[in-house]
Interface confidence: medium
């Protein structure tokens, strides 16, 4: 009975091997599977991830587009309109003016005396710029760049006044450290009494006479946003 | 003999005991990361779903946009064409006027008499709207809303006429429950000689001095769909 | 102890028995799941191929309509900026002209004699279309189609000319087999004067009051390509 | 090319009111720019009178501000000048011009024919 | 009002000889002014703007020059074509826009 026993003991020592060795490599290619899933898994992951940013980059860089033609078409409509119409309001600029915040502005790329460059736009039925605001301030100065450029800021009278009668006092202000200084130190006789953007944007007062660039503003028609009548 | 077995029996036992908490920990392993997996599976496959459910709503937004571009830039360049051409043939619509089914229509924002309104219209060479369908009456209707309008038929000098010749008799009407009635109740001197869009869109005749809003039509040449010759 | 030995060999075989059979369910278990887990992967990986290939395709035609929109508002803007201006120099062309290669070109749809043409494209500030190059007949030839068309070359005079003085002698030539030919036998009187694209783009002399279509052309101003200051 | 055109009656009766058309083309008088009129009398003499801007804003000579109208028809492309009680100092060759913006400055760059005006009883 | 006063009121020369004809403004105008050419018979022309640019088609011998209050306008060379009225005319300030008095060009 005992060799029965060591029989059925060697059979049984014999099978639990091949199962250990076969669950073993079962086991072990379940996890070589299991792994390559999961950096399969992961790498579809930043795949995804990356087809997500490229194409929502893509598609915000086609909006800006789309958004830029929808403002383009409108002003294009606007002047088509000012052309074939006869409504004695503006709604829209001219040609070659830009329009921000329902107001229009000319930008020169010549140089002028304050006065000149002041006279320049009341022809145009327009005035110096008038900056009322921070937003106001980059976007001229996006416009102009790193230029010394005329606005409709000055005291030639006394007191600091913008050419349009905005409140001097009140409202917004972006002088340099130490500006405005009224310095007689140039020569040229008197103190400096016209305002300025400067190179950085912020601004300093400055003789008169200088020949700088200047921005026009003229605002549009509140009356009436409606098309003219026909 | 028998302790040999003995000792070999558990020899196995305990080899047989640790492979088994040594399998069942791989198995609960594999089984875990399989979970996560199918998981992570599910959650990457509903974020695919969403954003391919995004971006298709993206792109059909900005294809929207971009049809109505299509369409507006083909407006504009034909409006540019007649600025600038000498074609006697208008192929499209003037600015700020609606073209649609080959007509153009243009909706007043002020009031006239009938007469004036009438007189508006020619000097556009134009006339008072004519609707011929009930397809042109909900057109209207959607664009002057619920207000009283002049229309282009009237019977001053007998019988209903529409002013561009148009045959009333065997025409379109929409008029309202027992109108029109040439009433003289009004006390404004003479009967109800002229036709107006009411509230709902329904028919009415009326003094012909009322200050109604009124609607002109011109229509495209039918002659020609090419652009004009330059 | 034999009868001790033996059941607990039969107990330790049950148990192994018990163990292999849940091993193989679970390991079996684990197995179909990655298969499952693997061939959704792969139906995400392609399904994923397949969005970013669909949502490129979209967004690629959406670009391509979008860079035509640049184009046609660059266009339709300077078009308006010379209907506006006093610019001497043209930087577009007008609308319903076609621009290629710093030229603008507009395609008649209906005929005339060679005069009546030439004297149409010379009210337009134009001349009848001068070849230069076999790159410019290429473009001419897609946009009349295989129909006859006059083009400005001539010889009424004597020997044969453009019109716009260009030499004929060392310029390019494309006349078809045996021609000109100066052909007497129409019965039209006189031979054949004036120069036309034949149906397949080559050239051939003809009577000059053949009602033929033609082409005008206009060169765009090299000297500034600037807007004009406003 | 941008052309102005002026007409107008050649005789005017004292008292009576001067009315004058200038008819523009190869521009749209809405699109931007003054438009000016501009007289000049028999002993050669320019008076600038007034304009009326692309946005129909007008200016006048002070001197006839009481006396001037400037107007416009911009369906026809044409403007207008109206003087009133006229005497036979307001005798002279009536000229509308454009009033063009340089970079640098202005200056009348285009100008009409000129009509001719007399007033007389 | 801002005052232009045009001098010589008239001049003869012969052709080919240099002209130089002045304007003075009775108040600074910067560089705002314009001078013009008027035939026998016809309409003024623009020949400068803004005191020293030539208006398009000027030919070169013709030279604006000055700011404030004192202009002037050289003709280098003349030629028959140049004789008839000359004219300024400034762009200051707030309307009028007065023109000066004139200068006869004649020929010797």
């Known amino acids: 009975q005992n060799s029965q026993l060591q029989e059925e003991l060697r059979g049984l020592r014999e099978t639990f091997s091949n199962f250990t060795a076969s669950t073993e490599a079962q086991v072990k290619g379940l996890s070589t599977q299991g792994g390559n899933v999961g950096r399969k898994m992961k790498s579809l992951e930043s795949q995804l991830e990356k087809q997500q940013k490229d194409l929502s980059e893509d598609h915000s860089s086609l909006l800006l587009h789309v958004k830029q033609f929808v403002s383009d078409l409108r002003s294009l409509s606007c002047q088509m309109a000012a052309l074939q119409g006869n409504g004695s309001e503006r709604t829209c600029c001219p040609v070659n003016w830009v329009e921000h915040e329902r107001s229009c502005y000319w930008f020169s790329r010549s140089g002028k005396a304050w006065a000149d460059a002041d006279n320049y736009c009341r022809l145009e039925d327009a005035h110096l710029v008038v900056v009322t605001s921070w937003e106001e301030q980059k976007f001229v100065q996006h416009h102009i760049g790193p230029v010394n450029t005329w606005m409709g800021l000055h005291d030639q009278n006394g007191p600091w006044k913008w050419v349009d009668g905005t409140d001097y006092e009140t409202g917004f202000k972006n002088w340099r450290p130490e500006q405005p200084d009224d310095w007689y130190g140039h020569g040229l006789g008197g103190g400096e009494d016209c305002a300025h953007f400067t190179d950085d944007g912020r601004w300093n007062d400055d003789v008169c006479q200088r020949p700088y660039r200047w921005v026009c503003e003229t605002e549009l028609d509140k009356a009436s946003q409606e098309p003219p009548l026909l | 003999q028998n302790s040999q077995l003995q000792e070999e029996l558990r020899g196995l036992r305990e080899t047989f005991s640790n492979f088994t908490a040594s399998t069942e920990a791989q198995v609960k392993g594999l089984s875990t990361q399989g979970g996560n997996v199918g998981r992570k599976m599910k959650s990457l496959e509903s974020q695919l779903e969403k954003q391919q459910k995004d971006l298709s709503e993206d792109h059909s937004s900005l294809l929207l946009h971009v049809k109505q571009f299509v369409s507006d830039l083909r407006s504009l360049s034909c409006q540019m064409a007649a600025l600038q051409g000498n074609g006697s043939e208008r192929t499209c619509c003037p600015v700020n006027w609606v073209e649609h089914e080959r007509s153009c229509y243009w909706f007043s924002r002020s009031g006239k008499a009938w007469a004036d309104a009438d007189n508006y219209c020619r000097l556009e060479d134009a006339h008072l709207v004519v609707v011929t369908s009930w397809e042109e009456q909900k057109f209207v209707q959607h664009h002057i809303g619920p207000v009283n309008t002049w229309m282009g038929l009237h019977d001053q000098n007998g019988p209903w006429k529409w002013v561009d010749g148009t045959d009333y008799e065997t025409g379109f009407k929409n008029w309202r429950p027992e109108q029109p009635d040439d009433w003289y109740g009004h006390g404004l001197g003479g009967g109800e000689d002229c036709a107006h869009f009411t509230d709902d869109g329904r028919w009415n005749d009326d003094v012909c001095q009322r200050p109604y809003r009124w609607v002109c039509e011109t229509e495209l040449d039918k002659a020609s769909q090419e652009p004009p010759l330059l | 102890q034999n009868s001790q030995l033996q059941e607990e060999l039969r107990g330790l075989r049950e148990t192994f028995s018990n163990f292999t059979a849940s091993t193989e369910a679970q390991v079996k278990g684990l197995s179909t799941q990655g298969g499952n887990v693997g061939r959704k992967m792969k139906s995400l990986e392609s399904q994923l191929e397949k969005q970013q290939k669909d949502l490129s395709e979209d967004h690629s035609s959406l670009l391509l309509h979008v860079k035509q929109f640049v184009s046609d508002l660059r266009s339709l803007s300077c078009q308006m900026a010379a209907l506006q201006g006093n610019g001497s120099e043209r930087t577009c062309c007008p609308v319903n002209w076609v621009e290629h290669e710093r030229s603008c070109y507009w395609f008649s749809r209906s005929g005339k004699a060679w005069a009546d043409a030439d004297n149409y494209c010379r009210l337009e500030d134009a001349h009848l279309v001068v070849v230069t190059s076999w790159e410019e007949q290429k473009f001419v030839q897609h946009h009349i189609g295989p129909v006859n068309t006059w083009m400005g070359l001539h010889d009424q005079n004597g020997p044969w000319k453009w019109v716009d003085g260009t030499d004929y002698e060392t310029g390019f030539k494309n006349w078809r087999p045996e021609q000109p030919d100066d052909w007497y036998g129409h019965g039209l009187g006189g031979g054949e004067d004036c120069a036309h694209f034949t149906d397949d783009g080559r050239w051939n002399d003809d009577v000059c009051q053949r009602p033929y279509r033609w082409v005008c052309e206009t060169e765009l101003d090299k000297a500034s390509q600037e807007p004009p200051l406003l | 090319d941008v052309q102005l055109q002026e007409s107008g009656p050649g005789l005017v009766k004292p008292s009576q009111s001067l009315s004058l058309t200038c008819t523009v083309t190869g521009y749209s008088i809405t699109s931007d720019y003054a438009w000016n009129w501009i007289r000049q009398f028999p002993g050669n003499k320019l008076e600038w009178m007034g304009y009326i801007s692309y946005s129909g804003s007008t200016r006048y000579n002070p001197s006839l501000k009481s006396r001037i109208s400037i107007t416009r028809d911009t369906s026809k492309n044409q403007f207008f000048l109206q003087l009133n009680s006229v005497t036979t100092e307001d005798t002279a060759t009536y000229y509308c011009?454009?009033?063009?913006?340089?970079?640098?400055?202005?200056?009348?760059?285009?100008w009409g024919q000129g009509t001719s005006v007399t007033v007389s009883s | 009002d801002i005052q232009m006063t045009q001098s010589p009121a008239s001049l003869s020369v012969f052709v080919g000889e240099i002209v130089t004809i002045t304007c003075r403004a009775s108040?600074?105008?910067?560089?705002?002014l314009a001078w013009y050419q008027q035939k026998q018979g016809k309409s003024p022309q623009l020949l400068v703007y803004?005191?020293?640019n030539l208006a398009d088609g000027v030919p070169s011998r013709f030279t604006g020059s000055g700011s404030g209050t004192q202009f002037s306008l050289k003709i280098n060379s003349l030629q028959s074509e140049d004789f008839g009225n000359y004219y300024c005319?400034?762009?200051?300030?707030?309307?009028?826009?007065?023109f000066g008095g004139g200068t006869k060009l004649e020929i010797k």
């Open positions: 108040e600074n105008i910067y560089s705002n």
């Open positions: 011009a454009r009033r063009y913006r340089y970079d640098e400055g202005y200056g009348m760059d285009y």
């Open positions: 005319q400034h762009f200051w300030g707030t309307p009028p826009w007065t």
């Open positions: 803004a005191a020293t």
